[in-house]
């Protein structure tokens, strides 16, 4: 039986709650989680509330809890060690996600080094308020070991979400992994759509629409990169790609006089504090083959 | 547009507390993540941790562990820096700052910053 | 942590010159960067996020690039107004890391 000194801290990892045993006349409370990074966790706790909830963390590194506790009487500090049991190496590794085609997300992971030929992984995710679990609905597998999953549905999802792939064995405890991802790091953007060109005598107008993504963005969020080329070029004549700020209206408008040579365009999208370029767009043509025209782009 | 407004120099014996405030207009403090970043005189820029208002969950460096406090008041607006066990190390510009996308432990470059409050520790 | 190291730490041009600032990471931040300038007695103010798109309101003559370990922050035609000092700082990996700056000075 614990001694009436300790507080009895315990957490579940399934809530990311950490609890103690209250004590009569508390005063004050803090409770603290510190990784292997040197980082410390500190959610809000009341006076009245015997735990504390955490959000912004990952323990696949091992961490430490911490409870301080005052009471009329005397001074509570409790540490509670959370290592991550099991086999050293056997974790999934390698672990990256990323949102395609506004709707879908493919998570991929590698197994463990050090794990057992029957090890069997299973991915969970949560959103960053801890609200809601979504169970992998459809895994992707590699001699029968689950190494990805394939969602169709993100609506559960918010701007950052938690990612927890466990491993099961019946021979040895297979370490788990977690991490913490924000949908605008792992966004893959369509390329923009309906890419068109009109030339009067001495300019031409590029324009393009902002592709649709599963992150609410404004115009403002958006770069993009426009390559204009001249058709049936030497291969190796490389040209530099024209950057371009997001509009209201998106359009690029640059000098071209008639007679053009055949040219094509293509647009790429990226958000602009992360630069993970689109693939490029169709390419919309302009100008025309006749072998006598000049090049004044 | 976004703004953020932070309290007076202050001076403080070693081994007292100071406590920063950080006023938002523009928007409110729970559409944000609001972080402390400080500057010793003549030296570079250091980041201590992040306090997210809606939920009150705080982030910093382990260096800081038992000595930084960051809270916020929605009904005003504020967020607050509290430092204890002052040492004349911690003497420097104090500043608050945010920006768009910026979360607890997120940011992407910090857009707006308060105007800096000096706290001078000095025996 | 991720050390960012800027170089120079300090550059002596005149108005009109072209400045070259540079910023390495230990290790590779993708192009989670950005570039601050500081006046003295001010704020920093962001200029270049995601490592070579300026902030709102930032001339062209300030042009950033690069991504991994090596970047560069470029300013096209030196302004007197752009004496002063600028700090790197990576967003790729907790805790966010500010290189030590670059004083750009008037020659």
């Known amino acids: 039986e614990k001694p009436a000194s300790s507080l009895n801290v315990r957490f579940d990892a399934r809530t990311m709650n950490l609890t103690w045993d209250c004590q009569e006349n508390t005063t004050f409370s803090r409770c603290f989680l510190t990784d292997k990074k040197g980082r410390v966790v500190e959610p809000r706790v009341t006076n009245k509330e015997c735990s504390c909830t955490f959000r912004e963390i990952c323990l696949h590194g091992g961490v430490t809890f911490e409870v301080h506790v005052n009471t009329s009487q005397r001074t509570f500090q409790e540490k509670l060690l959370y290592p991550n049991s099991g086999r050293e190496g056997t974790a999934a590794q390698n672990f990256s996600c990323f949102i395609y085609n506004v709707d879908f997300m493919n998570c991929t992971w590698a197994r463990g080094p050090k794990a057992p030929r029957d090890v069997q992984y299973f991915l969970y995710i949560q959103n960053s308020k801890r609200r809601r679990e979504i169970q992998c609905p459809y895994y992707i597998e590699d001699s029968g070991t689950h190494v990805g999953c394939h969602l169709g549905n993100l609506s559960g999802l918010t701007s950052r979400n938690y990612f927890l792939v466990n491993g099961t064995s019946q021979e040895i405890g297979i370490q788990f992994f977690d991490s913490l991802l924000d949908t605008k790091k792992i966004e893959r953007f369509n390329p923009p759509g309906n890419v068109t060109v009109r030339c009067n005598t001495t300019h031409c107008l590029v324009r393009w629409k902002q592709p649709r993504t599963y992150q609410k963005l404004s115009y403002l969020d958006f770069q993009y990169q426009l390559d204009v080329h001249r058709k049936n070029m030497q291969p190796g004549t490389e040209n530099l790609p024209i950057n371009v700020s997001g509009d209201l209206e998106n359009r690029y408008n640059f000098p071209s006089s008639e007679p053009r040579a055949k040219h094509a365009v293509k647009i790429r999208a990226a958000d602009v504090r992360i630069l993970n370029w689109s693939s490029w767009s169709e390419a919309a043509e302009f100008g025309s083959d006749e072998r006598h025209h000049h090049h004044h782009h | 547009q976004m703004q953020l407004v932070q309290s007076g120099a202050e001076v403080k014996k070693p081994g007292a507390s100071v406590k920063v405030s950080c006023k938002v207009s523009?928007?409110?403090?729970?559409?944000?993540?609001i972080h402390w970043v400080r500057q010793a005189p003549g030296k570079g820029l250091e980041w201590m941790g992040g306090?997210?208002?809606?939920?009150?969950?705080?982030i910093y460096a382990q260096k800081f562990q038992g000595r930084v406090t960051m809270t916020g008041d929605t009904s005003t607006d504020t967020a607050y820096l509290e430092l204890s066990s002052l040492r004349s190390e911690d003497t420097a510009l104090y500043y608050c700052a945010t920006g768009r996308y910026t979360s607890l432990a997120t940011t992407y470059g910090f857009d707006y910053w308060g105007q800096g409050t000096l706290v001078t520790v000095s025996s | 942590e991720i050390v960012m190291t800027q170089s120079p730490a300090t550059l002596s041009l005149s108005p009109g010159e072209r400045a070259t600032l540079s910023c390495r990471a230990s290790?590779?931040?993708?192009?989670?960067l950005a570039w601050y300038q500081q006046k003295p007695g001010q704020a920093p103010r962001l200029l270049i996020y995601g490592a070579s798109s300026r902030a709102t309101g930032i001339p062209d003559r300030f042009s950033g690039s690069g991504s991994g370990t090596d970047f560069t922050l470029t300013i096209s035609r030196l302004e007197p107004e752009d004496f002063a000092v600028y700090y790197c700082q990576q967003y790729d990996n907790w805790p966010y890391t500010f290189g030590q700056g670059t004083k750009l000075e008037i020659k």
């Open positions: 523009g928007y409110t403090l729970t559409e944000l993540s």
């Open positions: 306090f997210d208002p809606e939920d009150g969950e705080t």
């Open positions: 290790q590779s931040v993708s192009s989670y």
